[in-house]
Interface confidence: low
């Protein structure tokens, strides 16, 4: 039986050109995490494998940094980065847990609600 739950940063917003941290945490289960996939809609951004470490998709290598933890840092944000992001936890023996984060990238400095920051 799958007893775990995923906590995420939820719906967040950031400014174009800025950076943001996407984070998830799997709790309430003793299952072993074997791999975490980060996906944007249907695109694979990155994989963190328990044995093999991090792999960043080549098309995102310049703008995606691994961490903190099993999270992901997105840099040089564009309006096209707006959308759903998923952290997919592959665990044994439970199976797969999925967390959802919605990111809105705004043109102006009117990002009103969300966990955002800008790194100069």
């Amino acid at each position: 039986m799958m007893t775990g739950t995923i906590e995420t940063t939820g719906n967040i917003s950031a400014e174009k050109g800025g950076s943001i941290i996407l984070q998830c945490h799997l709790s309430s289960t003793t299952a072993q995490v074997t791999q975490v996939n980060w996906e944007q809609q249907d695109q694979l951004l990155a994989i963190c494998n328990a044995d093999l470490g991090w792999h960043i998709s080549p098309s995102f290598k310049d703008r995606v940094a691994p961490g903190p933890g099993l999270g992901l840092t997105l840099q040089s944000l564009t309006v096209n980065d707006t959308g759903e992001y998923f952290c997919i936890y592959h665990t044994y023996p439970d199976g797969t847990y999925t967390g959802r984060i919605f990111l809105e990238v705004l043109e102006s400095s009117v990002a009103e609600h969300g966990a955002r920051f800008q790194i100069p």
Epitope: E7, T8, T9, H25
Partner: nanobody, 113 residues
Framework: EVQLVESGGGLVQPGGSLRLSCAAS????????MGWFRQAPGKEREWVAS???????WYADSVKGRFTISADNSKNTAYLQMNSLKPEDTAVYYC???????WGQGTLVTVSS
């Protein structure tokens, strides 16, 4: 608009402790993310630690086991407890939160004998 005020910095000897606070006013951080960053002289700003609303925490390797991040949503305040401080921890420390717009002024931590 959110305003963030960091405090608690100062001069401390190596091995000493400090507790930083970050008070948020305006649009409060009712959930989501709280983070601390720091910027040492002549270096880029770097992430130090962050916490989710459920209390789950992450730390940079350089501070793991020495620093503790926490957030009190009822007081709209985040904290960074810094123990076993080293000279290389010297920096201006900044916090970020939901609805965060500009960086705050930060608070200077100097670790020196």
């Amino acid at each position: 608009e959110v305003q963030l005020v960091e405090s608690g910095g100062g001069l401390v000897q190596p091995g000493g402790s400090l507790r930083l606070s970050c008070a948020a006013s305006g649009n409060t951080f009712s959930g989501g993310f709280m983070g601390w960053f720091r910027q040492a002289p002549g270096k880029e700003r770097e992430w130090v630690a962050s916490v989710l609303r459920g209390g789950y925490t992450w730390y940079a390797d350089s501070v793991k086991g020495r620093f503790t991040i926490s957030a009190d949503n009822s007081k709209n305040t985040a904290y960074l407890q810094m123990n076993s401080l080293k000279p290389e921890d010297t920096a201006v420390y900044y916090c970020t939160t939901e609805g965060f717009d500009p960086w705050g002024q930060g608070t200077l931590v100097t670790v020196s004998s």
